[in-house]
């Protein structure tokens, strides 16, 4: 039999974005496997990913059950073959993730700007309700429908031709905002929840610049 | 169609080795972990690990470490399971199974026919 | 390992009756069980998945639930072709375990 003992994971980290949601961990298993268990603080330990050589994980499936729930994840280490376990009394070796919050910690993936319509001295620019894998009824839900008025959205906005920028606020997916008539503008947006402490911001979504062939254009 | 398919029945010695196969046929091999089950005469079902076709990583149950070798051969679909240093509470019918699609990946829903390993002086 | 307690051993029913056999977890497993079906000099079957999911071409007839650390295995209607020995398997913990088994007879 072999000599190799099996090692606990570590640096178990959980990557989160739109509820998109993968444990991660190390190290890469050298003659051992991996099984994932996850759970809420009242509930079951559920398994996954059984005797996997990833050092990874994709929880989303059970996390989107429920994403105010805080949940908590352990990975198990066992002997792949013949390889002795250091487990005591053929207890698995395991090591648990911190606490995961989802509806609280997941990143904000990065907004995209639908469409922007202009009407003499008004701009309304549209921001793309990015869809989640939390369902409802059979249905995946937006982020709007999950964060509600949670979620705010941020306009940066600038003339083509100046640096200076200006910014407005909404709590829908839509600005509606006063510019120069005959002025060419550049915007983008950024996703905010106020209420968090932990990853607030989405980062901008990429400039669009009126003029270049994007969104509907009316004098 | 997906099956299983076990090789014949074992007599062996007490401090013998034995080696079962099992071909599968039907489903794309590597995309499902195989199971071995063992049923002694008149008893339950006991499982005894599981390998992965696509890596060969092997998983025992305890009670076989170091007795139990699970491979595979990726070229004719078929996984092996030797046993070695038998004695007779080994006597049993010895199973592959497939484990199941992601949805139920532990589940056992293809079953070989079972190979009987009767262990005697 | 988790040990998987079945009850009952055996039992002897009608054509028609309501069978129901437990399996009882001797800790959590989630709804990580599943339920096979084992005639005489036959490979096992798998009937239900994941406690309560059907398997694919399985008679509606047979069912499972789950309370805790507790599963229920039923057979609405009993039929001849199901006298078998039935198998409960938790597969949330390693190794991967079975109940002892219940065996279903005819009356």
């Known amino acids: 039999s072999g000599t190799t003992n099996t090692v606990a994971a570590y640096n178990l980290t959980w990557k989160s974005t739109n509820f998109k949601t993968i444990l991660e961990w190390e190290p890469k298993p050298v003659n051992q496997v991996y099984t994932v268990q996850i759970s809420t603080k009242s509930g079951d330990w559920k398994s996954k990913c059984f005797y996997t050589t990833d050092t990874e994980c994709d929880l989303t499936d059970e996390i989107v059950k429920d994403v105010k729930q805080t949940y908590l994840a352990r990975v198990f280490s066992y002997p792949a073959g013949n390889v002795e376990s250091t487990g005591s009394a053929g207890e698995p070796l395991y090591e648990n993730s911190p606490e995961f919050t989802p509806y609280l910690e997941t990143n904000i993936g990065q907004p995209v700007i639908q469409k922007y319509e202009q009407g003499g001295t008004k701009l309304k620019v549209t921001v793309k309700d990015s869809f989640t894998l939390v369902r409802r009824n059979n249905t995946f839900l937006s982020l709007r429908d999950v964060f509600g008025k949670d979620l705010i959205y941020t306009l940066y906005y600038w003339k083509s031709s100046s640096s200076g920028k200006k910014t407005a606020k909404t709590n829908t997916n839509e600005f509606l905002i006063d510019v120069d008539k005959g002025e060419n503008y550049c915007f983008s947006v950024q996703a905010v929840i106020p209420s968090r402490t932990v990853n607030r911001k989405s980062t901008d979504s990429p400039v669009e610049c009126m003029g270049q062939e994007k969104g509907e254009f009316r004098e | 169609q997906v099956q299983l398919v076990q090789s014949g029945a074992e007599v062996k010695k007490p401090g013998a080795s034995v080696k079962v196969s099992c071909k599968a046929s039907?489903?794309?091999?590597?995309?499902?972990?195989m199971h071995w089950v063992r049923q002694a005469p008149g008893q339950g079902l006991e499982w005894m690990g599981i390998?992965?076709?696509?890596?060969?990583?092997?998983v025992y149950a305890q009670k076989f470490q170091g007795r139990v070798t699970m491979t595979r051969d990726t070229s004719t679909s078929t996984v092996y399971m030797e046993l070695s240093s038998l004695r007779s509470e080994d006597t049993a019918v010895y199973y592959c199974?497939?484990?199941?699609?992601?949805?139920?990946?532990?589940?056992?829903?293809?079953w070989g026919q079972g190979t009987m390993v009767t262990v005697s002086s | 390992d988790i040990q998987m307690t079945q009850s009952p051993s055996s039992l002897s029913a009608s054509v028609g009756d309501r069978v129901t056999i437990t399996c009882q977890a001797s800790?959590?497993?989630?709804?990580?069980l599943n339920w096979y079906q084992q005639k005489p000099g036959k490979a096992p079957k798998l009937l239900i998945y994941?406690?309560?999911n059907l398997e694919t071409g399985v008679p509606s007839r047979f069912s499972g639930s789950r309370s805790g650390t507790d599963f229920t295995f039923t057979i609405s209607s009993l039929q001849p072709e199901d006298i078998a020995t039935y198998y409960c398997?938790?597969?949330?913990?390693?190794?991967?375990?079975f109940g002892g088994g219940t065996k279903v007879e005819i009356k």
């Open positions: 800790q959590d497993i989630s709804n990580s």
């Open positions: 199974a497939r484990g199941g699609s992601k949805v139920a990946a532990l589940a056992f829903d293809i």
């Open positions: 390998i992965n076709p696509s890596g060969g990583i092997t």
């Open positions: 398997q938790q597969y949330n913990f390693h190794p991967l375990t």
């Open positions: 994941d406690a309560s």
């Open positions: 039907g489903y794309t091999f590597a995309n499902y972990y």
